[in-house]
Interface confidence: low
């Protein structure tokens, strides 16, 4: 025996209370497929949500977010607060990116600047809170000997040229090693200061501009979750 409800098209429901007559969906409800015994309540786009597509008898309403917010989740189930470029959303709201990180969008988290030296390149344009650094040619490419417009040098004995080159390479290597050593030393000191704060008594703590900026920026502790500061759910 065929189920009489299977004849009910989308936009109607099979009304058991009226001998399984196909009744139109009541206001604010819909059925997107035929043969349904009830209509679903339309989604209400309220508050920070805004109606992108009105509910019809056969399809649900679709929401998006009011200006200053953006959609998150399947079908825009949440509206999350926009931040400015150079900021990220934390549990305490929008916070500036920490030094060394940037965000060029109104959403998402601050990402570290590109480390040009890893690719053997140098920093051409410094990074900001809103923009990544721009890497340029490697330091070797920028050395005077690499310039394509230098006038031809007077001829010398081959041995002399080799000495100069060796000296130049040795100096460059020493400089690079010194830089790497200083960076490592700084990192180790920073780690020791964090791990053993009692070793570094108050006199070491100078309230520089950078230290003050640290409080206002969004450096996230391991236990602090991303987002969650400005999310609104329907």
């Amino acid at each position: 025996l065929q189920d009489p409800c299977s004849n009910c098209p989308a936009g109607t429901f099979c009304d058991n209370n009226r001998n399984q007559i196909c009744s139109p969906c009541p206001p604010n409800s819909f059925s997107s497929a035929g043969g349904q015994r009830t209509c679903d309540i339309c989604r209400q786009c309220k508050g920070v949500f805004r109606t992108r597509k009105e509910c019809s008898s056969t399809s649900n309403a679709e929401c998006d977010c009011t200006p200053g917010f953006h959609c998150l989740g399947a079908g825009c189930s949440m509206c999350e607060q926009d931040c400015k470029q150079g900021q990220e959303l934390t549990k305490k709201g929008c916070k500036d990116c920490c030094f060394g990180t940037f965000n060029d969008q109104k959403r998402g988290i601050c990402r570290p600047w590109t480390n040009c030296s890893l690719d053997g390149k140098s920093v051409l344009v410094n990074g900001t809170k809103e923009r990544d650094v721009v890497c340029g040619p490697s330091p070797a490419d920028l050395s005077p000997g690499a310039s394509s417009v230098t006038p031809p040098a007077p001829a010398r004995e081959p041995g002399h040229s080799l000495q100069v080159l060796t000296l130049f390479l040795a100096l460059t290597s020493a400089l690079l090693l010194a830089l790497i050593f200083i960076t490592l030393l700084f990192s180790v000191l920073k780690w020791i200061r964090k791990k053993f704060p009692h070793i570094f008594k108050q006199p070491f703590k100078k309230t520089t501009g950078a230290a003050q900026e640290e409080d206002a920026c969004s450096c996230r502790c391991p236990q602090e979750e991303e987002g969650g500061g400005g999310g609104y759910e329907l």
Epitope: P26, R43, K46, L234
Partner: antibody, heavy 123, light 107 residues
Framework: QVQLQQPGAELVRPGASVKLSCKAS????????INWVKQRPGQGLEWIGN????????NYNQKFKDRAKLTVDKSSSTAYMQLSSPTSEDSAVYYC????????????????WGQGTSVTVSS | DIQMTQSPASLSASVGETVTITCRAS??????LAWYQQKQGKSPQLLVY???TLAEGVPSRFSGSGSGTEYSLKINSLQPEDFGSYHC?????????FGGGTKLEIK
Amino acid sequence: QVQLQQPGAELVRPGASVKLSCKASGYTFTSYWINWVKQRPGQGLEWIGNIFPSDSYTNYNQKFKDRAKLTVDKSSSTAYMQLSSPTSEDSAVYYCTRFGSSGYPDYYTMEYWGQGTSVTVSS
Amino acid sequence: DIQMTQSPASLSASVGETVTITCRASGNIDNYLAWYQQKQGKSPQLLVYNAKTLAEGVPSRFSGSGSGTEYSLKINSLQPEDFGSYHCQQYWTIPYTFGGGTKLEIK
């Protein structure tokens, strides 16, 4: 914070009608469905129906459709349920509840509850 | 209407034990299920929605699971404040329907 205030108790004569109130505060009253739920002593919960205050659109459980009438007064942010011709079977605690603010369709879970009004039908 | 059958109707357990309450729907409700906790003389409180998502402020010892027509609520390491009644509710379709409730008592 979201609050739904209901009177503690109502005594009603059999056959006379009773109108229960639920005063909402702490949110935009017109933006959330208000539900009514019945609980008889020592028993489970029964959904009576709900109303969307913005346009007074209602859904009812067929079991209560003929005797329960849901209305709202937007000016006072109050929802009402009128129960006509009550019998001893209607002696119960009646809760008003508000749908939550989670993502759709979890929006349709009852996140906020009033304290409930205990209705006693007795002559 | 979708009928919700909850079991057991009552349950005795001791502090520290783990208990599981089940709820069966008469049709597929596709995870549109909520669990509520109710203490004696108080209003119910939302515990779990979407079958497995904990409501805000609910301790992690509570967990919801299931799909289709079979769902369950598990409480690990029972605490004194967990005793009371538990109700499941489907919001797949109107009329919204509740299970008969499970009374969890101290042993």
